[in-house]
C-alpha cells in the first residue's frame, strides 16, 4: 500500500487558447485531470488502473500552483494504491477549461481541453521528487512526482506491513526496510521478550518487564541465586530450594530440636557451669554456696549441719563457726572431754567406754543420730536421691525432686528417650546414657533414619535440554526442572512462541 504523489508547479498558456486553437472567453479557467495506470509502451486511452484525481480550477491561463500540503489542500495530488508497487507506471495529465462551475466530464464541451501530456517509465519508491517539464506548441507544464509508502508499509514496493507498538504483543519501532527494531530492554523475533536485570539467574529467574528479576518458586534475592528453606524449617538454611540444613546446635528434620540448650537458654544461675546432656537436657554444676537444679538456691554453709555433739552453727562471711556445748571442743565440736560417767548420751542412747574410759561412743536409738544422739535423723543427709535429684524433707518422710530425664522414688530410673519412637522408617532405638541412637534399616540414614539413601533416580541423566534433575525421595522417581523454552516430563518438547509466563 502506498501513494503516488503529483505536485503541479506551474502551467503556462500565454495566449489563453484551447487545444483547438480557439481562445477562451474571457480567459482559460484551468483545472487538471490526472490518470495513473499500469505501464504501457504506448500510452493509450482506457481504464486508469492505478487511479484518477481531479483538481478544482487552479488559475487562469498562466499561473504557478501553490503547495497546499501543509494546509490540508490538494497539492501535491494523492493517488493511493492498495497493492505492491510494480516499479513502472503510465501517467496522463489533462488541462481543461471550465466555462462554468460544473467540472464533471459530461458537463463540459468536448473542445474544452487545453492540453494533454502522457509519460511512462520506471519509478522506485522513495522520498525524492522527480522534476519534469512537458512543453507543447502552446502550453508548458512543470511538475514533480514520487511514490511513497502508506503509514505502516515499508520496503522497495511498499509490500511489508510494520506497525510500531509497545504492548503485550511487542515493543518495537520499524526500520526503513520494514524490519522490527526493538525498544530498549526488549528482545526476540517480535520484541516480546524482556531483557532481565543483568546477572539475573538464567534458570531461577525471569522477568515480565525490562531490568526486572523475578524469582521462580523456591528462590530469592536480587538475582534469584539464593534458595528459600523449607516452610517448616526453624533453625536451618538451604543450598537448594525447600531444604533445611540445621544451624549449629540444632537437629531434627525441621531443625527444631535444641541440641545446645546451654547456649540457647543459659539455664544455670549464679555462675554455674552448664553441660548439654541430650535434646533439651542439661546439667548445672553449682559454685560453692549454691544448690538447686539450676543452682538458683543460695546455700547457707550451716545448712549441712557441720557442728557435732550439739554444737550450734553461726554463718560467717568466710564460712561458719561452731559454738560447742560444755565438754566438747574442736572445729566441729568433734572432740569430747566427757566420759560415760557424765551420761553424755541423749534420747535414750546407750554409752560405751573407749580407750580405757578416756573416750566414749553413744549407740543411738532409731530416729536419732549425732555423737551424743542429740539430733533427730535428717532423712536427706544420706543423699538418697540418685542422678543429681534434690532431696526434700516432708515431716516424717522425704521425697526426691528429679532432674529432667530421670524418674522413680530415688530418681534412679532413666526416662527412656526411645519412648517417643523417634526413629523414622522402622529404625531401631537404643537408649544411651546421654540420649539415644537409631539403627536404620537399609536405604535410610541420618540421626533419626530420616534421610532416604536409596537408588538415585537421576543417575541415568533422564532429563533433556540441560534440565535440572531432582530425585523424589518418597517415590524413588525423578522430576525434571525444565529450562525456559522446554516442557514435558523429561523437558523433551520445545515450547512454541510466544510463551506465557515461562515456568
Amino acid at each position: 500500500s502506498g501513494v503516488f504523489q503529483l505536485q503541479l508547479q506551474e502551467f503556462i498558456n500565454e495566449r489563453g487558447v484551447l487545444a483547438s486553437g480557439r481562445p477562451c472567453e474571457p480567459g482559460c479557467r484551468t483545472f487538471f485531470r490526472v490518470c495513473l495506470k499500469h505501464f504501457q509502451a504506448v500510452v493509450s486511452p482506457g481504464p486508469c488502473t492505478f487511479g484518477t484525481v481531479s483538481t478544482p480550477v487552479l488559475g487562469t491561463n498562466s499561473f504557478a500552483v501553490r503547495d497546499d500540503s501543509s494546509g490540508g489542500g490538494r497539492n501535491p495530488l494523492q493517488l493511493p494504491f492498495n497493492f505492491t508497487w510494480p516499479g513502472t507506471f503510465s501517467l496522463i495529465i489533462e488541462a481543461w477549461h471550465a466555462p462554468g462551475d460544473d467540472l464533471r466530464p459530461e458537463a463540459l464541451p468536448p473542445d474544452a481541453l487545453i492540453s494533454k501530456i502522457a509519460i511512462q517509465g520506471s519509478l522506485a519508491v522513495g522520498q525524492n521528487w522527480l522534476l519534469d517539464e512537458q512543453t507543447s506548441t502552446l502550453t508548458r507544464l512543470r511538475y514533480s512526482y514520487r511514490v511513497i509508502c502508506s503509514d505502516n508499509y515499508y520496503g522497495d514496493n511498499c509490500s511489508r506491513l510494520c506497525k510500531k507498538r509497545n504492548d503485550h504483543f511487542g515493543h518495537y519501532v520499524c526500520q526503513p526496510d520494514g524490519n522490527l527494531s526493538c525498544l530498549p530492554g526488549w528482545t526476540g523475533e517480535y520484541c516480546q521478550q524482556p531483557i532481565c536485570l543483568s546477572g539475573c539467574h538464567e534458570q531461577n529467574g525471569y522477568c515480565s518487564k525490562p531490568a526486572e528479576c523475578l524469582c521462580r518458586p523456591g528462590w530469592q534475592g536480587r538475582l534469584c541465586n539464593e534458595c528459600i528453606p523449607h516452610n517448616g524449617c526453624r533453625h536451618g538454611t538451604c543450598s537448594t530450594p525447600w531444604q533445611c540444613t540445621c544451624d549449629e546446635g540444632w537437629g531434627g528434620l525441621f531443625c527444631d530440636q535444641d541440641l545446645n540448650y546451654c547456649t540457647h537458654h543459659s539455664p544455670c544461675k549464679n555462675g554455674a557451669t552448664c553441660s548439654n546432656s541430650g535434646q533439651r537436657s542439661y546439667t548445672c554444676t553449682c559454685r560453692p554456696g549454691y544448690t538447686g537444679v539450676d543452682c538458683e538456691l543460695e546455700l547457707s554453709e550451716c545448712d549441712s549441719n557441720p557442728c557435732r555433739n550439739g554444737g550450734s552453727c553461726k554463718d560467717q562471711e568466710d564460712g561458719y563457726h561452731c559454738l560447742c556445748p560444755p565438754g566438747y571442743y574442736g572445729l566441729h565440736c568433734e572432740h569430747s572431754t566427757l566420759s560415760c560417767a557424765d551420761s553424755p548420751c541423749f534420747n535414750g542412747g546407750s554409752c560405751r567406754e573407749r580407750n580405757q574410759g578416756a573416750n566414749y561412743a553413744c549407740e543411738c536409738p532409731p530416729n536419732f543420730t549425732g555423737s551424743n544422739c542429740e539430733k533427730k535423723v535428717d532423712r536427706c543427709t544420706s543423699n538418697p536421691c540418685a542422678n543429681g535429684g534434690q532431696c526434700l524433707n516432708r515431716g516424717p518422710s522425704r521425697m526426691c525432686r528429679c532432674r529432667p530425664g530421670f524418674t522413680g522414688t530415688y530418681c534412679e530410673l532413666h526416662v527412656s528417650d526411645c519412648a517417643r519412637n523417634p526413629c523414622a522408617h522402622g529404625g531401631t532405638c537404643h537408649d544411651l546414657e546421654n540420649g539415644l541412637m537409631c539403627t536404620c534399616p537399609a536405604g535410610f540414614s541420618g540421626r533419626r533414619c530420616e534421610v532416604r539413601t536409596s537408588i538415585d533416580a537421576c543417575a541415568s541423566s533422564p532429563c533433556f535440554n540441560r534440565a535440572t534433575c531432582y530425585t523424589d525421595l518418597s517415590t524413588d522417581t525423578f522430576v525434571c526442572n525444565c529450562p525456559y523454552g522446554f516442557v514435558g516430563s523429561r523437558c523433551e518438547f520445545p515450547v512454541g512462541l510466544p510463551p506465557s509466563f515461562p515456568w
Epitope: 521462580r216 536480587r222 528459600i228 524449617c233 506465557s500
Partner: antibody, heavy 118, light 107 residues
Framework: EVQLVESGGGLVQPGGSLRLSCAAS????????MAWVRQAPGKGLEWVAT????????YYRDSVKGRFTISRDNSKSTLYLQMNSLRAEDTAVYYC???????????WGQGTLVTVSS | DIQMTQSPSSLSASVGDRVTITCRAS??????LAWYQQKPGKSPKLLIF???NLADGVPSRFSGSGSGTDSTLTISSLQPEDFATYFC?????????FGQGTKLEIK
C-alpha cells in the same frame, strides 16, 4: 514455637504515616524471607510487600509502590513496614508473615489494625 | 496478575460430611498453590502447599489435589473446629494472589 507479634497499628488521617513492627521468635530470623499481607475489613487477603533474607531485596504490590517501605533488622529479629501517604483504601488488618512472593506464607502473626480516616 | 476464583463462595455442611472447595487460576500455576484456614478474629493458618503437601501439624482429613489451573481442597470428615473461611493462593507468578475465600458454615 514460632511467634510473630505485630505492633504499631492505629488510627491515622489520610496522608499520614505509620510504622508497623513485627517481632519474630522461635526460628532463625536472618535465614528466612519475610512479608506483609493485609486484609480489609470483611474482605480477602492481599499481599503487600516482601523482603529477601539474603540481600534485603524488596518487592511491593503496585498500589503501595513509592509509599510503603519494608525493611528488617536481623540483629533484633524484627520486620518493619513504613507506611507514608496513607489512603482510606489502606485500611486493613496487617499481618506479618514468613514467606516470599513465590513461596507459601508458612507462619502468620496475630495482625495489627490500621485505620485511615479523617 | 493471575486471577484466583474460588467456588463456592459459601457452603453449609454438617459434622462428618465430606466437603470439597475448588480454586481456578486464570492461567497455569504449575502446582504452586497453597490453602489457608482462617477463623473469625484470627490470623490465617497454612494447611496445604504445593497443591497437595500437608503443612506440619495439619490433620490428615485435609487433602489437596489438582494440576494446571484447577485445584481442590477436600475435608474427608468435617469436625466442629473446621468451620472457618478457606483461601487459596498461587505463588507461581508475581505478584502472589489469593482467592476471594470460601466460608464453611454449620448446616
Amino acid at each position: 514455637e514460632v511467634q510473630l507479634v505485630e505492633s504499631g497499628g492505629g488510627l491515622v488521617q489520610p496522608g499520614g504515616s505509620l510504622r508497623l513492627s513485627c517481632a519474630a521468635s522461635g526460628f532463625t530470623f536472618s535465614n528466612f524471607p519475610m512479608a506483609w499481607v493485609r486484609q480489609a475489613p470483611g474482605k480477602g487477603l492481599e499481599w503487600v510487600a516482601t523482603i529477601s533474607s539474603s540481600d534485603g531485596t524488596t518487592y511491593y504490590r503496585d498500589s503501595v509502590k513509592g509509599r510503603f517501605t519494608i525493611s528488617r533488622d536481623n540483629s533484633k529479629s524484627t520486620l518493619y513496614l513504613q507506611m507514608n501517604s496513607l489512603r482510606a483504601e489502606d485500611t486493613a488488618v496487617y499481618y506479618c508473615s514468613r514467606g516470599y512472593y513465590n513461596s507459601p506464607f508458612a507462619y502468620w502473626g496475630q495482625g495489627t489494625l490500621v485505620t485511615v480516616s479523617s | 496478575d493471575i486471577q484466583m476464583t474460588q467456588s463456592p463462595s459459601s457452603l453449609s455442611a454438617s459434622v462428618g460430611d465430606r466437603v470439597t472447595i475448588t480454586c481456578r487460576a486464570s492461567e497455569d500455576i504449575y502446582s504452586n498453590l497453597a490453602w489457608y484456614q482462617q477463623k473469625p478474629g484470627k490470623s490465617p493458618k497454612l494447611l496445604i502447599f504445593d497443591t497437595n503437601n500437608l503443612a506440619d501439624g495439619v490433620p490428615s482429613r485435609f487433602s489437596g489435589s489438582g494440576s494446571g489451573t484447577d485445584s481442590t481442597l477436600t475435608i474427608s470428615s468435617l469436625q466442629p473446629e473446621d468451620f472457618a473461611t478457606y483461601f487459596c493462593q498461587q505463588y507461581n507468578n508475581y505478584p502472589p494472589t489469593f482467592g476471594q475465600g470460601t466460608k464453611l458454615e454449620i448446616k
